[in-house]
Interface confidence: low
């Protein structure tokens, strides 16, 4: 199984960014870390969606990764989709260093994450408490600033 | 709310070496990772090096093989040792911290010039 991968994150507009996982054991919580920069000040959904595949752009990836058919949730919420990480928060200079321990997300298995995209939205991810429908769908983070495909990495 | 104080910046010729350090104003041991990042004039910051508290490193292309982030939590202390520094290393450095969850904390920065 892969214990390490990579995310290149790259959009139509200035944002960019690199995330690394690392799974130490197969089982084991996912550390997931980087750094992105060109964000507006404040929080940012951040997700893995469904498809690996960005060859319209980001809107190709599809919805938030969700084998188990749940509503959209916070990452330490029970009712959530395999792919909510939640927030990354911007600084002033729009720089969010990222620093996530996920459990649900794996490399390896059902809820592997490999071959899928990560993406990074507009707007703040309600974590399905917003009170619409659209809440537990996406948890209004609105449009996709950028994207990558999350690859094995050495 | 921690308060980073970065040090050992300064003056070095292409080829030279430099120790930066970043002490902490409270412990370390139970933030989740630490970063050097820079910014050298008119351009934007970018991320140099960061440490988990697992021990996971992560580096910069442009840096890779040259520099080496260490953390020693019992001097609440962040280290990044410079090697084989070049013209275009000269930039301000600036440590971070980021505990889980956000938002993170922020050094001054410490000036770095690499400088025949």
């Known amino acids: 199984m892969a214990t390490k991968a990579v995310c290149v994150l790259k959009g139509d507009g200035p944002v960019q960014g690199i995330i690394n996982f690392e799974q130490k054991e197969s089982n084991g919580p996912v550390k997931v870390w980087g750094s992105i920069k060109g964000l507006t000040e404040g929080l940012h959904g951040f997700h893995v969606h469904e498809f690996g595949d960005n060859t319209a752009g980001c809107t190709s990836a599809g919805p938030h990764f969700n084998p188990l058919s749940r509503k959209h949730g916070g990452p330490k919420d029970e009712e959530r989709h395999v792919g909510d990480l939640g927030n990354v928060t911007a600084d002033k200079d729009g720089v969010a260093d990222v620093s996530i321990e996920d459990s649900v997300i794996s490399l390896s298995g059902d809820h592997c994450i490999i071959g899928r995209t990560l993406v990074v939205h507009e707007k703040a991810d309600d974590l399905g408490k917003g009170g619409n429908e659209e809440s537990t769908k996406t948890g209004n983070a609105g449009s996709r600033l950028a994207c990558g495909v999350i690859g094995i990495a050495q | 709310q921690v308060q980073l104080v970065e040090s050992g910046g300064g003056i070095v010729q292409p080829g030279g070496s430099l120790r930066l350090s970043c002490v902490a104003s409270?412990?370390?041991?139970?933030?989740?990772?630490m970063y050097w990042h820079r910014q050298a004039p008119g351009k934007e910051r970018e991320l140099v090096a960061g440490i988990t508290n697992d021990g996971t490193r992560y580096y910069a292309d442009s840096v890779k093989g040259r520099f080496t982030i260490s953390r020693d939590n019992a001097k609440s202390t962040l280290y990044l040792q410079m090697n084989s520094l070049k013209f275009e290393d000269t930039a301000m450095y600036y440590c971070?911290?980021?505990?889980?969850?956000?938002?993170?904390?922020w050094g001054q920065g410490t000036q770095v010039t690499v400088s025949s």
């Open positions: 409270e412990s370390i041991s139970e933030i989740d990772a």
């Open positions: 971070a911290a980021l505990p889980n969850p956000p938002p993170g904390y």
